[in-house]
Amino acid sequence: EVEKTACPSGKKAPEIDESLIFYKKWELEACVDAALLATQMDRVNAIPFTYEQLDVLKHKLDELYPQGYPESVIQHLGYLFLKMSPEDIRKWNVTSLETLKALLEVNKGHEMSPQVATLIDRFVKGRGQLDKDTLDTLTAFYPGYLCSLSPEELSSVPPSSIWAVRPQDLDTCDPRQLDVLYPKARLAFQNMNGSEYFVKIQSFLGGAPTEDLKALSQQNVSMDLATFMKLRTDAVLPLTVAEVQKLLGPHVEGLKAEERHRPVRDWILRQRQDDLDTLGLGLQGGIPNGYLVLDLSMQEALS
């Protein structure tokens, strides 16, 4: 807290400029008008103030706006943003994407601080939903943002926003999240043609049901093994050998290297050995010829 002292004669700041870097903390407090500071915030970033001096400037703004800063000030905070606490930020009403971008730019290269986390939460809540432009901005700065949202939060993401999602944004999404995102992606990309559709939907396929995988197998998509290995085991199990062969195309040979891993391992156990042999890959562990296969799940459903 800076003591209230009168401004020395001739030191009253007529504007925010470089001369202020020579002011002591108490002089800044006494000689810089808070309203002037608020209207000339854009100049602060160009002046090499010390951290102590920035503390004084923040204090002046806090006194002027005890209920929280207006967006006109927030947008030009620049490095002063790094001085804000989550409690300060909770008082703000940030509605402009330009303001959000400006503040995230200041924090670029830094980690996801509690301040930034609070800012993003305030912004998204204010918008009411995660629209495409917001998602575009957030994933550009923090590629893992989407995968940090709960399935419940993701359910309110409109399908149109999915266009902003890049494959790397889904790197750390778990199966529960992909279960929510996949139907949205399917809806978003539904008007694309076969090959273009597959390129876009590929990253989301960890949430795809069996019937969609069967449909894809009819479209010569040549799914790579990395994508196949991320599919839901329960979605892969009902696929026939012929369907998997069509789904993977030339990549089917890769099954051999993955035969001990899920979902390939579990899928092999469900196939007739005769059918597996038609692939000519030496896959072992299928159901021996002559054995009767009972679908117990169907039996339970009927009883």
Partner: nanobody
Framework: QLQLVESGGGLVQAGGSLRLSCTAS????????AKWFRRAPGKEREWVAS???????GYDDSVKGRFTISRDLAKNTVYLQMNSLRLEDTAVYYC?????WGQGTQVTVSS
């Protein structure tokens, strides 16, 4: 780049318990949640548990009821409490947050 450090792994008998920790460096906020994945010898990486931004949690069916994920925002740390450990839980456990990954901690369950 966010640094994540896992700890708490070790050798434990089947039926025993361990608590893994994942701590984020510097001023990073764990308020954006984190996940635990694991990779067993000769197997693909698989998801174990998540704590999401809003504080809700999710678990793979294989660990549901046995493992509990939690976070301490003041300590920038996410925990994985593992009870009733089984032989098949043997793996290297990795923590991830905001697309960053830790180096992993080895958990070995013996009979």
């Amino acid at each position: 780049q966010l640094q994540l450090v896992e700890s708490g792994g070790g050798l434990v008998q089947a039926g025993g318990s361990l608590r893994l920790s994942c701590t984020a460096s510097g001023s990073t906020s764990m308020s954006y949640g984190a996940k635990w994945f694991r990779r067993a010898p000769g197997k693909e990486r698989e998801w174990v548990a998540s704590v999401y931004r809003d504080g809700t949690t999710g678990y793979d069916d294989s660990v549901k009821g046995r493992f509990t994920i939690s976070r301490d925002l003041a300590k920038n740390t996410v925990y994985l409490q593992m009870n009733s450990l089984r032989l098949e839980d043997t793996a290297v456990y990795y923590c991830t947050a905001l697309n960053s990954w830790g180096q992993g901690t080895q958990v070995t369950v013996s009979s």
